[in-house]
């Protein structure tokens, strides 16, 4: 059981993907901190020449949904929805393979950006994955 909060997204960096949907946050005032972190991460990504168009098309919304996960409306307690494991793996191993290798070896990016670990996500056919966030 989580002990976080569900609250409307109130930032701008990810507004195109999230709108004003309800997102899960571990503490009431965490959104601002994460907004600043993701802005800093996007700045680093944007100023590096390591991001291909095919990768960014899916990586940017994926990072937004990872940083600001939708709340699981089916749950009786505040609970985040996971990214879908199959999409996470396609992103990591196919669309953004080069970019992931670069990011994982770059401490400046790792400092600002928490990359999703696909292995932590529920298996595609499991009940836990039924409500995952599809990009």
């Amino acid at each position: 059981e989580e002990d976080g909060f569900c609250q409307p997204y109130r930032g701008i960096a990810c507004a195109r993907f999230i709108g004003n949907r309800t997102v899960y946050m571990e503490s009431l005032h965490m959104q601002g901190e994460i907004e600043n972190q993701i802005t800093a991460a996007f700045t680093m990504i944007g100023t590096s020449s390591h991001l291909s168009d095919k990768c960014s098309q899916f990586a940017i919304p994926s990072l937004c949904h990872y940083a600001f996960p939708y709340c699981d409306e089916t749950s009786s307690v505040p609970k985040p929805r996971d990214l879908c494991r199959d999409e996470c793996e396609i992103l990591e191993n196919v669309l953004c393979q080069t970019e992931y290798i670069f990011a994982r070896s770059n401490p400046m990016i790792l400092m600002r950006l928490k990359l999703p670990n696909c292995e932590d996500l529920p298996q595609p056919e499991s009940p836990e994955a039924a409500n995952c966030i599809r990009i």
């Epitope: 960096a13 195109r16 993907f17 601002g32 600043n36 802005t39 700045t43 944007g46």
Partner: antibody, heavy 118, light 107 residues
Framework: EVQLVESGGGLVQPGGSLRLSCAAS????????IHWVRQAPGKGLEWVAA????????QYADSVKGRFTISADTSKNTAYLQMNSLRAEDTAVYYC???????????WGQGTLVTVSS | DIQMTQSPSSLSASVGDRVTITCRAS??????VAWYQQKPGKAPKLLIY???SLYSGVPSRFSGSRSGTDFTLTISSLQPEDFATYYC?????????FGQGTKVEIK
């Protein structure tokens, strides 16, 4: 040197349209949120709209939602405010300003006056 | 939307005076508040961000503080160039909102 320069203001009739431009220089345009803030004659500041060019995400004040559209052209380092269905109460000096994260508007343009009158 | 109620709307003070302006948020905004100074015919200037952080180049006589949903801008010793209008603004949630402004005039 960071610079924001607004243009496009002028006199327009109620119901008319106008497009404001905000030309940015001296910083990485797509990394900052660009805002429009207005100030009616003798009144206080009112935030109007914002765009984060990197993700093309936008936000609007309720008073302009559905009438105004903010956009950005990263190749020209310019943000725009398309204002339609203008009303007398939209008369104001319009400023563009930039922000990084949630740290306040650190640079502002000089402002451009929009007058809506018949 | 979050309302920022600023007081007083105007005040008269003399050079050397200590001046305090307050802003109350209608709900919790954490420390996501900025303060600006504006002179007639000019764009506003950022003074304080994150409730109490002094923006680069701003004199140290300006300071900001927070107590719950109450925010204070203090000018420790008013200088001639400080006569202006001051605005608070919340950064916690879009739409961003400003206080009504406080005009600091010469007594």
């Amino acid at each position: 040197e960071v610079q924001l320069v607004e243009s496009g203001g002028g006199l327009v009739q109620p119901g008319g349209s106008l497009r404001l431009s905000c030309a940015a220089s001296g910083f990485t345009f797509s990394s900052y949120v660009i805002h429009w803030v207005r100030q009616a004659p003798g009144k206080g500041l009112e935030w109007v709209a914002a765009i984060y060019p990197y993700t093309s995400s936008t936000q609007y004040a309720d008073s302009v939602k559905g009438r105004f559209t903010i956009s950005a052209d990263t190749s020209k380092n310019t943000a725009y405010l398309q204002m339609n269905s203008l009303r007398a109460e939209d008369t104001a000096v319009y400023y563009c300003a930039r922000s990084y994260g949630t740290g306040g508007f650190d640079y502002w343009g000089q402002g451009t006056l929009v007058t809506v009158s018949s | 939307d979050i309302q920022m109620t600023q007081s007083p709307s105007s005040l008269s003070a003399s050079v050397g005076d200590r001046v305090t302006i307050t802003c109350r948020a209608s709900q919790s905004v954490s420390s996501a508040v900025a303060w600006y100074q504006q002179k007639p015919g000019k764009a506003p200037k950022l003074l304080i961000y994150s409730a109490s952080s002094l923006y680069s180049g701003v004199p140290s006589r300006f300071s900001g503080s927070r107590s719950g949903t109450d925010f204070t801008l203090t000018i420790s010793s008013l200088q001639p160039e400080d006569f202006a209008t001051y605005y608070c603004q919340q950064w916690y949630s879009y739409p961003l909102t400003f206080g009504q402004g406080t005009k600091v005039e010469i007594k």
